[in-house]
């Protein structure tokens, strides 16, 4: 797996760096996560047919992924900080049981998956420091988690492969939409 | 890194319009985010718009309404149409692309860039 933000190479051959701004160090954990999400698709796509179908019969799916809409305020038309960030950090929480079902569909990326997984917990709590409105966030709960995860599990192999694909897919569109709209604040 | 060639600009009356064209090579076009920036004599180099991955939009203030940024992932191409064009208007465009499809109002943000077009716009 890839060596987190601020722990490669770079950083440690310039001791004199100024220290990243939060803004920086969320725009750098996301793009740390985009390219861990990168190399899991390659596995996926080299696996099975699944990338080639089109974004119209992959619509067809009972997954209730996090996207971004209009009235989240994340994007130029009704654009709101406080709104879109709290809808990036509840979309992110609603991620992670998704997240913990790639943990055992990756063969030679398991720890890549891994990587991903703890990235996104990372960039939770950078998010939640820079929120002023913590209430408006609600967390996912741990019961319905647990049975939508058995649920996801027990799928034939086919179906797997798709979910697996889809929520790919999505969380990589859900964080470009969110660091496009982090980079507006 | 992709290589992007502008083309389309030259000059035009206020009110006017013009559409430029940036066609890139050498990557997986579908997956940037394109993005047009422009600099007039004088002045630092300034966002105009940009359209991610998913095909999300963001314009600056100054072309809001009166520029539309569009692509075709089939012929690797992004498109400025500029409609109602002013004398302030007038500068060399440049298209450019960020990799993580996610794009963004600064400079930094993008990793490959064109040689530019000039647009000039006469009152």
């Known amino acids: 797996a890839p060596v987190p933000p601020g722990e490669d190479s770079k950083d440690v051959a310039a001791p004199h760096r100024q220290p990243l701004t939060s803004s920086e160090r969320i725009d750098k954990q996301i793009r740390y996560i985009l390219d861990g999400i990168s190399a899991l698709r390659k596995e996926t796509c080299n696996k099975s047919n699944m990338c080639e179908s089109s974004k119209e019969a992959l619509a067809e799916n009972n997954l209730n992924l996090p996207k971004m809409a209009e009235k989240d305020g994340c994007f130029q038309s009704g654009f709101n900080e406080e709104t879109c960030l709290v809808k990036i950090i509840t979309g992110l929480l609603e991620f992670e049981v998704y997240l913990e079902y790639l943990q055992n569909r990756f063969e030679s990326s398991e720890e890549q998956a891994r990587a991903v997984q703890m990235s996104t917990k990372v960039l939770i709590q950078f998010l939640q420091k820079k929120a002023k409105n913590l209430d408006a966030i609600t967390t996912p709960d741990p019961t319905t988690n647990a049975s939508l995860l058995t649920k996801l599990q027990a799928q034939n192999q086919w179906l797997q492969d798709m979910t697996t694909h889809l929520i790919l897919r999505s969380f990589k569109e859900f964080l470009q939409s969110s660091l496009r709209a982090l980079r507006q604040m | 890194e992709v290589q992007l060639v502008e083309s389309g600009g030259g000059l035009v009356q206020a009110g006017g319009s013009l559409q430029l064209s940036c066609t890139a090579s050498?990557?997986?076009?579908?997956?940037?985010?394109m993005a047009w920036f422009r600099q007039a004599p004088g002045q630092e180099r300034e966002f105009v718009t940009d359209?991610?991955?998913?095909?999300?939009?963001w314009y600056a203030d100054s072309v809001k309404g009166r520029f539309t940024i569009s692509r075709d992932n089939a012929k690797n191409t992004v498109y400025l149409q500029m409609d109602s064009l002013r004398p302030e208007d007038t500068a060399v465009y440049y298209c450019?692309?960020?990799?993580?499809?996610?794009?963004?109002?600064?400079?930094?943000?993008?990793?490959?860039w064109g040689q530019g077009t000039q647009v000039t716009v006469s009152s």
């Open positions: 450019a692309a960020d990799s993580y499809g996610v794009g963004g109002g600064a400079e930094r943000y993008y990793d490959s």
């Open positions: 359209i991610g991955e998913s095909g999300g939009t």
């Open positions: 050498g990557g997986t076009f579908s997956e940037y985010a």
